[in-house]
């Protein structure tokens, strides 16, 4: 039978389950711990201070809590303040908290005290430095000079004059003695470690103000702007550079260093980049306003003048042409130019245009052509209507005929085609 | 026809100072860049001097810079090259030369020179 | 300055045959702008210089297509497929990438 049926082993209102290898378990309501929920929980106390977390277990039978406490706080309750928190110990010392709950520092070597901030003066202690090398205290640990002929930390070691290697930027180490050693040096490197790069310079080939910059065992050359190659000795030509050297329509003419353009109207410069101020020789008339253009200017006139260089009085200002015409100034003697409107000639645009007289009726269908000031009527005949009588009157679209007659437009009438049955003007 | 004609040439004492024209005709020679190319008795070319189309630049070998100046008149077609501080190794027949192309450099027309010859 | 090597120094040329004058710079003559600026001249015995080839392998107006220039770097020839009377003289080469410009000390052709 399943062993939760013999009777619920849970004590205390535990639910008793069954796990998958058909053993009964029991779950625990708050405040009670152990197998069979028979032990008292003291967590439900709250026995941890502050923020510290409790967790139950039981040992042997016993039910036992443990605090996990927040920083700044330790004890089995976690009640007492953390004394490493303010970091005490020195130099990367490890803290931990003392019997006593003060805090203790593990210092790192060379380092010495309650908070590890004193130095240890190695120097003091014995005499770390053989072979007569000279022991010298450093902030947590010490240095030895070691005499000739000994190298090493602790001068515990013969000197070996190429090991490692005096010899720098891949100079070969050669020992000419016990202790002495002569540096190889690769080319473009001196000095005793061959740690001084040869200046290249004197003695260099750029040419045409070509700038030399020393590099190891050669040189380059900084050429201005109009040379190139590895000595400055080529010739660039600006012509072929893009963007064009010579701006604005300029023609581009290389020289031997340089270049020249040829700058089209109204643009100077070197590079053919400024636009010539064409209003510096400009002559307008006192009053006018001169704007510079390329190759070219713009006198712009006070109100009467008019002319390239305003130096004719305005002909418009009075009003010289008659209403609606357009007054235009002549720009070389000043006169008014009156552009008439339709049905107006005349240099003043004053005088009538005789529709009626001037080539053929402009009225279609022989309509009667009546003048009129500045335009013409057309009085149309029978049948026809419109402003020059061109279309054709529609006498069907008042619908006359009657009883479903076919009505047929005439020119000014109409004629009425009649069922059967039915006759008269209108089939009526 | 385009011909360039050189005179000016002579004899003339080591220090002393000499000036070569060339007289250029059959084409505009205000367009063409211009150079003068010395050969010593029985030896090969050398390049002297060089001057732009418009006169501004010019330019000249170590050989005699300083000495000599290359100069034009374009309103006179006439090429000038002003010799100073003469030395016998100056001696040679002197050419001026065309630049077909200011891209390239090379020579499409030649003078007949004028010989140079500096001796005590 | 470039130095401009030209062999042979002289050359002796049956009327028909080909002849070959090769030139030799000390510095590459490929401009950075791309071009080779290396010439072809003739001195005729009593004349100027005239122009033959230009920018290595360029034959200028009114020279015969007999002759033809070739080479790259350093390394530069001018070949006469049939040699005639009238082209003996000096040919000089000549470069104009660096400055200052130089020239062969010259090729003396003449007729068997």
């Known amino acids: 039978a399943p062993p939760c049926l013999d009777g619920s082993p849970c004590a205390n209102g535990g639910r008793c389950t069954q796990l998958p290898s058909r053993e009964a378990a029991c779950l625990c309501p708050p405040g009670w711990v152990g197998e069979r929920c028979q032990l008292e929980d003291p967590c439900h106390s709250g026995p941890c201070a502050g923020r510290g977390v409790c967790q139950s277990s039981v040992v042997a039978g016993t039910a036992r809590f443990s605090c996990r406490c927040p920083r700044g706080f330790r004890g089995p309750d976690c009640s007492l303040p953390d004394p490493c928190l303010s970091s005490p110990c020195a130099h990367g010392a490890r803290c931990s908290v003392g019997p006593d709950g003060r805090f203790l520092c593990s210092c790192p070597p060379g380092y010495q005290g309650r908070s590890c901030r004193s130095d240890v003066d190695e120097c003091r202690v014995g005499e770390p430095c053989r072979h007569g090398g000279t022991c010298l205290n450093t902030p947590g640990s010490f240095r030895c000079q070691c005499p000739a002929g000994y190298t090493g930390p602790l001068c515990e070691n013969p000197a070996v004059p190429c090991a490692p290697s005096p010899c720098r930027n891949g100079g070969t180490c050669r020992q000419s003695g016990d202790l002495t050693y002569d540096c190889a040096c690769l080319p473009g490197f001196e000095g005793q470690n061959c740690e001084v790069n040869v200046d290249d310079c004197p003695g260099h080939r750029c040419l045409n103000g070509g700038t030399c910059v020393d590099g190891v065992n050669t040189y380059n050359c900084q050429c201005p702007p109009e040379w190139t190659g590895q000595f400055c000795t080529e010739d660039v030509d600006e012509c072929q550079l893009q963007p064009n050297a010579c701006h604005n329509g300029g023609t581009c003419f290389n020289t031997l260093g340089g270049h020249s353009c040829v700058c089209v109207n109204g643009w100077t410069g070197e590079s053919c980049s400024q636009n010539i101020d064409d209003c510096a020789t400009a002559v307008c008339f006192h009053g006018a306003t001169c704007h510079d253009r390329v190759a070219s200017f713009y006198c712009a006139c006070p109100m009467g003048k008019t002319g390239l260089l305003c130096h004719l009085d305005d002909a418009c200002v009075s009003n010289p042409c008659h209403e609606d015409a357009i007054c235009d100034t002549n720009p070389v003697n000043g006169r008014a130019i009156c552009t008439c409107p339709p049905g107006f000639t005349g240099g003043a645009c004053d005088q009538d245009v005789d529709e009626c007289s001037i080539g053929a009726n402009p009225c279609e269908h022989l309509g009667r052509c009546v003048n009129t000031q500045g335009s013409f009527l057309c009085q149309c005949g029978r049948g026809y209507t419109g402003p020059r009588c061109e279309t054709d009157v529609n006498e069907c679209l008042s619908g006359p005929c009657r009883n479903q007659a076919t009505c047929l437009d005439r020119i000014g009438q109409f004629t009425c085609i009649c069922m059967a049955g039915f006759t008269g003007t209108y089939c009526e | 026809e385009v011909q360039l004609l050189e005179s000016g040439g002579g004899l003339v004492q080591p220090g002393g100072s000499l000036r070569l024209s060339c007289a250029a005709s059959g084409f505009a020679f205000s367009h063409y860049d211009m150079s003068w190319v010395r050969q010593a008795p029985g030896k090969g070319l050398e390049w002297v001097s060089y001057i732009s189309r418009g006169g501004g630049s010019t330019y000249y070998p170590d050989s005699v810079k300083g000495r000599f100046t290359i100069s034009r008149d374009n309103s006179k077609n006439t090429l000038y090259l002003q010799m100073n501080s003469l030395r016998a190794e100056d001696t040679a027949v002197y050419y001026c030369?065309?630049?077909?192309?200011?891209?390239?450099?090379?020579?499409?027309?030649w003078g007949q020179g004028t010989m140079v010859t500096v001796s005590s | 300055d470039v130095v401009m090597t030209q062999t042979p120094l002289s050359l002796s040329v049956t009327p028909g045959q080909p002849a070959s004058i090769s030139c030799r710079s000390s510095?590459?003559?490929?401009?950075?702008?791309?071009?080779?600026?290396l010439h072809w001249y003739l001195q005729k015995p009593g004349q100027s210089p005239q122009l033959l080839i230009y920018?290595?392998?360029n034959r200028f107006s009114g020279v015969p297509d007999r002759f033809s220039g070739s080479g790259s770097g350093t390394d530069f020839t001018l070949k006469i497929s049939r040699v005639e009377a009238e082209d003996v003289g000096v040919y000089f080469c000549?470069?104009?990438?660096?400055?200052?410009?130089?020239f062969g000390q010259g090729t003396k052709v003449e007729i068997k």
């Open positions: 920018k290595v392998s």
């Open positions: 000549s470069q104009s990438t660096h400055v200052p410009w130089t």
């Open positions: 030369g065309r630049h077909a192309t200011t891209a390239y450099w090379y020579f499409d027309v």
């Open positions: 510095q590459s003559l490929v401009h950075t702008q791309g071009n080779t600026y």
